[in-house]
């Protein structure tokens, strides 16, 4: 960067090279050029010459003052106008940064995705700091009192093999940068309570052209967890509001869920699961799109037609289908 240049003098920043965004700062440039009493000293920010708020301090030094500096990063350098020199002479350069001290990390969450072999811990870091901010994740066994620390820039994956201190732990996060340090509240976890089942995936959909057309959604998970609760949400792609259906599921076979939907409409489906009675859900699965066919059966009652198509009731019976979808994208 700019800091690697050969200097004929030096440049420094007050209060510091890394400072709080919005502060007033002063950048000083002091020339030490052989056979040159500088006529003028010039400052450049990101290659653009600065025009205002430059004050000469003495024969060799000038100050550039910025009010309410808001740029996260800038490369500064200064030059001298030497008598009998046609071009400006480079004095020195420095990279400067502005940002914020970290907020207190909150919403610390640790989960074990089934089969991953890792405990994944995440948190809400708060407002953007703009400067290099490091996080230390502390994991302390409540059984052995042993504490381990993990350094990261965002989230952390901790191998479950390294968690040798039993099942119960305290987890907390420390955030630190050049402008400050903060620590989260402690989260108490039990390894058995934080497992998230293997991802549930919608594999296909089919609409059966019966008296009342019905759509069957096929979905599955590779989980070995016995008691799993799932939710499937669906809506017409033109709608804002989701319909949600709940299931107690046994994944020893592919799940089939039946819906009565409006004809000739594109729907989107998503599913998620959790170990029954536990805290953490899977994220919603990728959107699965299915368009119902145009054919509208003859129905005597408009009210009945309307109610049935909008009910979205799940039916226990299983049927073989005619119109099939297998499109994960749009």
């Amino acid at each position: 960067g700019i800091t690697n240049i050969n200097c004929s003098g030096h440049i420094w920043v007050e209060p510091a090279t890394i400072f709080k965004m919005g502060m007033n700062i002063s950048i000083y440039c002091q020339a030490a050029i052989k056979n040159c009493q500088p006529r003028k000293l010039h400052f450049y920010k990101n290659g653009i010459k600065e025009r205002f708020q430059i004050t000469r301090i003495n024969k060799t030094t000038a100050r550039l003052w910025y009010k309410n500096f808001l740029e996260p990063h800038a490369s500064m350098y200064c030059t001298a106008e030497c008598p009998k020199h046609f071009q400006e002479t480079l004095i020195c350069g420095k990279d400067i940064s502005s940002g914020y001290p970290p907020d207190i990390p909150d919403e610390v969450t640790c989960v074990i995705y089934e089969y991953s072999g890792n405990m994944t811990c995440t948190w809400n870091a708060g407002k953007l700091t703009y400067i290099d901010t490091k996080y230390v994740v502390h994991v302390k066994s409540l059984e052995t009192e042993e504490e381990q620390q993990y350094l990261t820039s965002s989230y952390i994956n901790i191998s479950t093999d390294s968690l040798q201190g039993g099942k119960k732990y305290l987890v907390w996060v420390q955030a630190a940068n050049a402008l400050g340090m903060e620590e989260s509240k402690q989260l108490q976890i039990h390894l058995d309570d934080i497992v998230i089942p293997s991802a549930a995936v919608i594999s296909r959909a089919e609409t059966i052209n019966a008296t009342v057309p019905k759509t069957i959604i096929y979905w599955d998970s590779q989980t070995t967890i016995e008691k799993v609760s799932c939710e499937m949400r669906y809506k017409a792609t033109t709608n804002q509001t989701w319909n949600v259906k709940e299931f107690d599921t046994n994944f020893t076979y592919v799940q089939q869920s039946e819906f009565y939907l409006e004809p000739n409409i594109k729907y989107v489906f998503q599913v998620r699961c959790q170990e029954t009675g536990k805290r953490y859900w899977q994220p919603w699965s990728s959107p699965f799109f299915h368009k119902t066919p145009e054919t509208v059966p003859q129905v005597t009652s408009k009210a009945f037609q309307h109610d049935t198509w909008n009910s979205g009731l799940t039916v226990a019976s299983i049927s073989t289908g005619h119109l099939t979808s297998d499109n994960r994208g749009d």
Epitope: R39, K40, K49, R51, I54, T55, R56, E81
Partner: antibody, heavy 119, light 107 residues
Framework: QVQLVESGGGVVQPGRSLRLSCAAS????????MSWVRQAPGKGLDLVAD??????????YYADSVKDRFTISRDNSKNTLYLQMNSLRAEDTAVYYC??????????WGQGTLVTVSS | DIQMTQSPSSLSASVGDRVTITCRAS??????LAWYQQKPGKAPKLLIY???SLQDGVPSRFSGSGSGTDYTLTISSLQPEDFATYYC?????????FGQGTKVEIK
């Protein structure tokens, strides 16, 4: 050689607007700072507005007396400097000179254009 | 802004006289000073820049000197065409500022 020709001066009523132009030739226009310097009758020279060169990202400066009323601009493709003068006052009456600066002193000047603000 | 004070505000002199005009800055301007000559109805003309450098085409009877806050324009032998008003300009700190002018009149 360097030539600067101002135009657009004249008699105008207080509160009205006027736009001055300065056509430049004989130098690399975008590499030079351009200024408007005025001289009230029988008085000294005053920098009114300045628009700097490309290396300064064309930063502008205005004297306190004209801030929020005057706007300096340049069209590098036409080698022309402008001064848009709004809400003119009697005290804006002066000869307005267009001037060139490479360093910060004014190297070349136009012949000037007279602006008279009178009711 | 840096204030520039010129003295005298006017002077009377004869052809052949040595004339000295001074300019004082409110702070050190590190030889960033220019001198201009202005004749009635005409634009100012640059005579000297960087306190002592003569602009191309300017007669050698004009010279400039000084450092720190005090600067001088000297006309070694006044000529008829030199009767005019002279201005100093500091360009050490932005914005550049002019002195109030010195009028050189025929005695």
């Amino acid at each position: 050689q360097v030539q600067l020709v101002e135009s657009g001066g004249g008699v105008v009523q207080p509160g009205r607007s006027l736009r001055l132009s300065c056509a430049a030739s004989g130098f690399d226009f975008s590499s030079y700072g351009m200024s408007w310097v005025r001289q009230a009758p029988g008085k000294g020279l005053d920098l009114v507005a300045d628009i700097n060169s490309k290396s300064y990202n064309y930063a502008t400066y205005y004297a306190d007396s004209v801030k929020d009323r005057f706007t300096i601009s340049r069209d590098n493709s036409k080698n022309t400097l402008y001064l848009q003068m709004n809400s003119l006052r009697a005290e804006d009456t002066a000869v307005y000179y267009c001037a060139v600066h490479h360093s910060d002193y004014f190297e070349y000047w136009g012949q000037g254009t007279l602006v008279t603000v009178s009711s | 802004d840096i204030q520039m004070t010129q003295s005298p505000s006017s002077l009377s002199a004869s052809v052949g006289d040595r004339v000295t005009i001074t300019c004082r800055a409110s702070q050190d301007i590190y030889t960033n000073l220019a001198w201009y000559q202005q004749k009635p109805g005409k634009a100012p003309k640059l005579l000297i820049y960087h306190a002592s450098s003569l602009q191309d085409g300017v007669p050698s009877r004009f010279s400039g000197s000084g450092s720190g806050t005090d600067y001088t324009l000297t006309i070694s032998s006044l000529q008829p065409e030199d009767f005019a008003t002279y201005y100093c300009l500091q360009d050490s700190e932005y914005p550049p500022t002019f002195g109030q002018g010195t009028k050189v009149e025929i005695k």
